[in-house]
């Protein structure tokens, strides 16, 4: 899943998502997350896994919304 690269490193929150993952990431693998920039042409929630991979996901997907709600509350 591609995100726009940044001179500040691969996980800088100004990245934009162009495609989304087609699979549900296991919750226990997620270490961190952020929302892509409001100026991006497509929405995106980027989950960062414990292995350091950043994965673009669609905020409209229910599992993404569930994960965000869970992480916000905990």
């Amino acid at each position: 899943t591609k995100t726009e690269s940044s001179s500040r490193g691969p996980y800088h929150p100004s990245e934009c998502c162009f495609t989304y993952t087609t699979y549900k990431i296991p919750r226990q693998r997620i270490m961190d997350y952020y929302e892509t920039n409001s100026q991006c042409s497509k929405p995106g929630i980027v989950f960062i896994t414990k292995r350091g991979h950043s994965v673009c996901t669609n905020p409209s997907d229910k599992w993404v919304q569930d994960y965000i709600k869970d992480m916000k509350e905990n």
């Epitope: 100004s14 952020y34 929302e35 892509t36 409001s38 100026q39 929630i45 905020p59 916000k72």
Partner: antibody, heavy 122, light 108 residues
Framework: CQSLEESGGDLVKPGASLTLTCIGS???????AIWWVRQAPGKGLEWIA?????????TEYATWAKGRFTISKTSSTTVTLQMTSLTDADTATYYC???????????????WGQGTLVTVSS | DVVMTQTPASVSAVVGGTVTIKCQAS??????LSWYQQKLGQPPKLLIY???TLASGVPSRFKGSGSGADYTLTISDLECADAATYYC??????????FGGGTEVVVK
């Protein structure tokens, strides 16, 4: 013309419960978010809760508001805020506000009611 | 929770002058930021959203900028009617929707 109007503000004693009501006119509750925001006398704005997501009715609460405040959609044009165990610190003007939903989440608040005053005092 | 810190708490300027208000989030909010204006005895009014987009009917004298965790509201060609308190708010999906503490603008 869109508008929101709050009601239910009152003078109550500490420990009491109170329900505030927000009625919308010309406002699409199903495609927008509804927020409750409060402002203590002479102080800043403090968000309490919001309800969004159309039929799914997702809700979010400020950390401090969880458990004591409940936001609910009671009809196609009405949203309520139930408040329990009120204290002096809850004395404020309570605003109902309409917010845009962008990319599945509530964003900016573009429509505000005039507010309703809640006073908690013994 | 994301903490929104506004500076200064109060600022004074003359008619025709310029005022700059800063809003700093405790972590990046990816330009998901709104600015509101509140006059005494009135509800707040949306000025700017997505950090830099003017709300409908808001004059271009109001300008929002910034990214990451740091944002600025600049009001140029100040008018008496701009005397108010200004608030920023985080609107990102992944954090709480907290407001800044507010900045009072006094126009002389």
């Amino acid at each position: 013309c869109q508008s929101l109007e709050e009601s239910g503000g009152d003078l109550v004693k500490p420990g009491a419960s109170l329900t505030l009501t927000c009625i919308g006119s010309g406002f699409d509750f199903s495609s927008n978010a509804i927020w409750w925001v409060r402002q203590a006398p002479g102080k800043g704005l403090e968000w309490i809760a919001c309800l969004y997501g159309g039929t799914s009715g997702s809700t979010e609460y400020a950390t401090w508001a969880k458990g004591r405040f409940t936001i609910s959609k009671t009809s196609s044009t009405t949203v309520t805020l139930q408040m329990t165990s009120l204290t002096d610190a809850d004395t404020a003007t309570y605003y109902c506000a309409g917010g845009v939903v962008t990319w599945s989440y509530p964003r900016q608040l573009y429509l505000w009611g005039q507010g309703t005053l809640v006073t908690v005092s013994s | 929770d994301v903490v929104m810190t506004q500076t200064p708490a109060s600022v004074s300027a003359v008619v025709g002058g310029t005022v700059t208000i800063k809003c700093q989030a405790s972590q990046s909010i990816s330009s998901w930021l709104s600015w509101y204006q509140q006059k005494l005895g009135q509800p707040p009014k949306l000025l700017i959203y997505s950090a830099s987009t003017l709300a409908s009917g808001v004059p271009s004298r109001f300008k929002g900028s910034g990214s990451g965790a740091d944002y600025t509201l600049t009001i140029s060609d100040l008018e008496c009617a701009d005397a108010a308190t200004y608030y920023c708010q985080s609107n990102t999906a992944v954090h709480t929707y907290n407001f800044g503490g507010g900045t009072e603008v006094v126009v002389k």
